[in-house]
Interface confidence: low
C-alpha cells in the first residue's frame, strides 16, 4: 500500500519534507521517482543511490528515508507532487501530494508607529 499526507502546507522561504510511505510484505523497492509538473525532482535507485538534476540541486535534498526535503520554497512551488515507487515484482505504486506554499507572514506585518 501507498500512503501520503495528501495536502500539506509550508511557508514561503521555508522548507518542507515530501514523504510517501510504501509498505508491502512481498515487494522490494528498486527505484523511487519524485516528480513535479512533469519535471524530475529526484531519482533514487537501489543500485546507485540518489540523483538530483542540476536544476533542483540547490533546493532539493534527498531524505529523510526515500522522501525529499524541498528548501527555499516560493509560491510558484505550489502544486502537485508525485512519488513513483518502482517495486519488484509487484510493479509501480504512485502517490500524490498537494503542496500549498503560503506567503510569508512577514509580508503581512504592519509597522506600528513608535
Amino acid at each position: 500500500t501507498m500512503e501520503t499526507k495528501g495536502n500539506i502546507s509550508a511557508e514561503e522561504g521555508g522548507s518542507v519534507v515530501l514523504q510517501c510511505h510504501f509498505s508491502s510484505d512481498t515487494a522490494e523497492v528498486t527505484q523511487v521517482n519524485w516528480e513535479q509538473r512533469d519535471q524530475l525532482l529526484a531519482v533514487y535507485s537501489v543500485d546507485l543511490g540518489w540523483y538530483v538534476p542540476s536544476v533542483f540541486s540547490d533546493r532539493v535534498v534527498p531524505g529523510p528515508s526515500l522522501g525529499l526535503t524541498f528548501q527555499s520554497l516560493t509560491t510558484n512551488d505550489t502544486g502537485e507532487y508525485f512519488c513513483t515507487y518502482h517495486t519488484y515484482p509487484d510493479g509501480i505504486y504512485k502517490g500524490r501530494i498537494f503542496l500549498k506554499v503560503q506567503e510569508s507572514s512577514a509580508h503581512f506585518q504592519i509597522a506600528l508607529p513608535g
Epitope: Q31, N33, L40, D47, S54
Partner: antibody, heavy 116, light 110 residues
Framework: QVQLQESGPGLVKPSETLSLTCTVS????????MSWIRQPPGKGLEWIGI?????NTYYANWAKGRVTISKSSNQVSLKLSSVTAADTAVYYC????????????WGQGTLVTVSS | DIQMTQSPSSLSASVGDRVTITCQAS??????LAWYQQKPGKAPKLLIY???TLASGVPSRFSGSGSGTDFTLTISSLQPEDFATYYC????????????FGQGTKVEIK
C-alpha cells in the same frame, strides 16, 4: 567469454506485440545492467530501456506504456506492444548503460520487420 | 530530459587526417559519457567510456576528452578502417530520457 545473442520472430504484424530475448553467457545478470537499443533502417541508434541488477527498469519516454523489459537467470526479454511500421528496426541488447563503463559488449542484432 | 547533440552530422576526411567530433549534453553529465563506432551491417563497438578511458583493444589514435556538458572524440591519424559512424551516449541518467545517444557522425572518405 562474454556473449550476447538476440532471438525472436523477424516479422510481426501491425498492432501485435514484438517479443525478443537476449541470451547471455560469460557473466551474471544478477550484477549487471542490461540495455535494449534499436536502429531503424538507415537511421541512428534509439535507446529503448534498461534493466538493473535488482530488476529495476527505466524506459525511454517514447516507449513508456508500450515496453516491458524483464529478466530471468540468463535471459533478458523485451516486449513492445501495439507495433507499427515505425518499429521496424534492428534490435540490439548490450551489457551496461547506466553509470557503468559503457555498453559492452553488444549482441549482433536482429532485424524485426513490422508488416501485414 | 537530457539531450545529446553531436556535430558535425557527417564529415569527409583523408587517411592520415586528424578528426574531431563533438558531443554536447543539455545538462551536466559529469564524465558519464561513452563513444561508439559502428560500421554498416555491424553492431556498435565501444571505443571510450567515462569520457576519456580507452576501451580494451581500441587503438591509441582514438582519444576522448571533456566533462560536464562538452565532450570530444579525436582520431589523431585517420586510418582506412576508421571510416564509420560514431555515436556518443550519456549514461548519467536513464529516468525520463528520450534517447541516451547522439544522432551520430558519419566519417566518409574525401
Amino acid at each position: 567469454q562474454v556473449q550476447l545473442q538476440e532471438s525472436g520472430p523477424g516479422l510481426v504484424k501491425p498492432s501485435e506485440t514484438l517479443s525478443l530475448t537476449c541470451t547471455v553467457s560469460g557473466f551474471s545478470l544478477s550484477s549487471s545492467y542490461m540495455s535494449w537499443i534499436r536502429q531503424p533502417p538507415g537511421k541512428g541508434l534509439e535507446w529503448i530501456g534498461i534493466i538493473g541488477s535488482n530488476g529495476n527498469t527505466y524506459y525511454a519516454n517514447w516507449a513508456k506504456g508500450r515496453v516491458t523489459i524483464s529478466k530471468s537467470s540468463n535471459q533478458v526479454s523485451l516486449k513492445l506492444s501495439s507495433v507499427t511500421a515505425a518499429d521496424t528496426a534492428v534490435y540490439y541488447c548490450a551489457r551496461g548503460g547506466y553509470r557503468t563503463s559503457g555498453m559492452d559488449p553488444w549482441g549482433q542484432g536482429t532485424l524485426v520487420t513490422v508488416s501485414s | 530530459d537530457i539531450q545529446m547533440t553531436q556535430s558535425p552530422s557527417s564529415l569527409s576526411a583523408s587517411v592520415g587526417d586528424r578528426v574531431t567530433i563533438t558531443c554536447q549534453a543539455s545538462q551536466n553529465i559529469y564524465s558519464d559519457l561513452a563513444w561508439y563506432q559502428q560500421k554498416p551491417g555491424k553492431a556498435p563497438k565501444l571505443l571510450i567510456y567515462r569520457a576519456s578511458t580507452l576501451a580494451s583493444g581500441v587503438p591509441s589514435r582514438f582519444s576522448g576528452s571533456g566533462s560536464g556538458t562538452d565532450f570530444t572524440l579525436t582520431i589523431s591519424s585517420l586510418q582506412p578502417e576508421d571510416f564509420a559512424t560514431y555515436y556518443c551516449q550519456q549514461e548519467h541518467l536513464v529516468a525520463w530520457i528520450y534517447n541516451v545517444f547522439g544522432q551520430g557522425t558519419k566519417v566518409e572518405i574525401k
